[in-house]
Interface confidence: low
Amino acid sequence: AGSDSLYVPCAPSPCVNGGTCRQTGDFTFECNCLPGFEGSTCERNIDDCPNHRCQNGGVCVDGVNTYNCRCPPQWTGQFCTEDVDECLLQPNACQNGGTCANRNGGYGCVCVNGWSGDDCSENIDDCAFASCTPGSTCIDRVASFSCMCPEGKAGLLCHLDDACISNPCHKGALCDTNPLNGQYICTCPQGYKGADCTEDVDEGNSHHHHHH
């Protein structure tokens, strides 16, 4: 072979990833690697992953002479040690008037009466704890319930006998039941008065209410 084909260890440089070649003999060389690389030609990126130094379930991702932690959604920061404030990130995290409370590694909702669930989206079934009298129908409302009474029953819980059942109001008067005590209330037509709307009145007076 001619002199122009002589092997020169550092021409071209066999060192990769920014490594610097140094000729150490006629046919030998040494690569001075940049931080983060190793190997005879600096071909290997040193795995800098720090094992369990990534906190709170973070996954380590190797870089060049550094590493990063890929954090689960509720954590942030270089090592997944800083709590994400979900209440700031998600202003509507809690529904139906619930109040967001940031916690380490998550958040919680403080729900207003009548709502439950992680995000206060579940209307509490108030009928599950209601005491409507058997035979009546419970209707769930937000933070309350109401009882639909069967014929002959009255009161908030349908626990009272309906005084209107005996038709105590006369002369076409309207009969209503007081939901607190079950007594009847007669709304008298024009020209009548009295508890049962049996008394005549002057033409000038109309629609008297009488409670019994």
Epitope: C49, P50, N51, R53, Q55, F79
Partner: antibody, heavy 117, light 112 residues
Framework: EVQLVQSGAEVKKPGASVKVSCKAS????????IHWVRQAPGQGPEWTGY????????KFNEKFKGRATSTVDTSITTAYMELSRLRSDDTVVYYC??????????WGQGTLVTVSS | DIVMTQSPDSLAVSLGERATINCRSS???????????LHWYQQKPGQPPKLLIY???NRFSGVPDRFSGSGSGTDFTLTISSLQAEDVAVYYC?????????FGGGTKVEIK
């Protein structure tokens, strides 16, 4: 070049506290955990605890919980470890070491703490 | 804590000969991420430990290729294929799979 330079030797009385510093250079300080490792004369090293420079979060060997604290001053890329209620068996060399590869990759030169009455 | 037991305590080897150091852990060092965090350090008098091998068999930057590591699970070996004068030191294994990180008791390597 990564360098960790520690404060000088200390002589303390039993019951006192000692604070060792570790000045880091040659890399991004907040990117790596700083560990504290201690070594008694003629013994193997013993991991004491670590600090996460970015957040100031710490974790300690149960053996030193309640006595050891660690802090950082990121403005001067320096970590500190303080050990309180010193006893004679705390006569050891304290090393700071930089984390990496799940191990301790670069070490300070060590700080000898002597506890003697 | 994980107990790391090294053997032998000391070792005298002729220059150019092979030196073998063993390290056994009290339980498996395979981490849940699949890696085994077993490392080897060299310490000379008055100096801090120096990382030689990380995660069983990976040579750290600038470490001569006469140093090699092997093993799995609970049993690990550091081998110096051809002992040099500058290799006289104490060698430690370290596990960082389980909290807290723990070192072995050390093996002193001398020249015969």
């Amino acid at each position: 070049e990564v360098q960790l330079v520690q404060s000088g030797a200390e002589v303390k009385k039993p019951g006192a506290s000692v604070k060792v510093s570790c000045k880091a250079s040659g890399y991004t300080f907040s990117n790596y955990v700083i560990h504290w490792v201690r070594q008694a004369p003629g013994q193997g090293p013993e991991w004491t605890g670590y600090i996460i420079p970015g957040s100031g979060g710490t974790k300690f060997n149960e053996k030193f919980k309640g006595r050891a604290t660690s802090t950082v001053d990121t403005s001067i890329t320096t970590a500190y470890m303080e050990l309180s209620r010193l006893r004679s068996d705390d006569t050891v060399v304290y090393y700071c070491a930089r984390d990496g590869a799940g191990s301790f990759t670069y070490w300070g030169q060590g700080t000898l703490v002597t506890v003697s009455s | 804590d994980i107990v790391m037991t090294q053997s032998p305590d000391s070792l005298a080897v002729s220059l150019g000969e092979r030196a073998t150091i063993n390290c056994r852990s009290s339980q498996s060092l395979v981490h849940s991420d699949g890696n085994t965090y077993l490392h080897w350090y060299q310490q000379k008098p008055g100096q801090p430990p120096k990382l030689l091998i990380y995660r069983i068999s990976n040579r750290f930057s600038g470490v001569p290729d006469r140093f090699s590591g092997s093993g799995s699970g609970t049993d690990f070996t550091l081998t110096i294929s051809s002992l040099q004068a500058e290799d006289v030191a104490v060698y430690y294994c370290l596990q960082s799979t389980h909290f807290p990180d723990t070192f072995g008791g050390g093996t002193k390597v001398e020249i015969k």
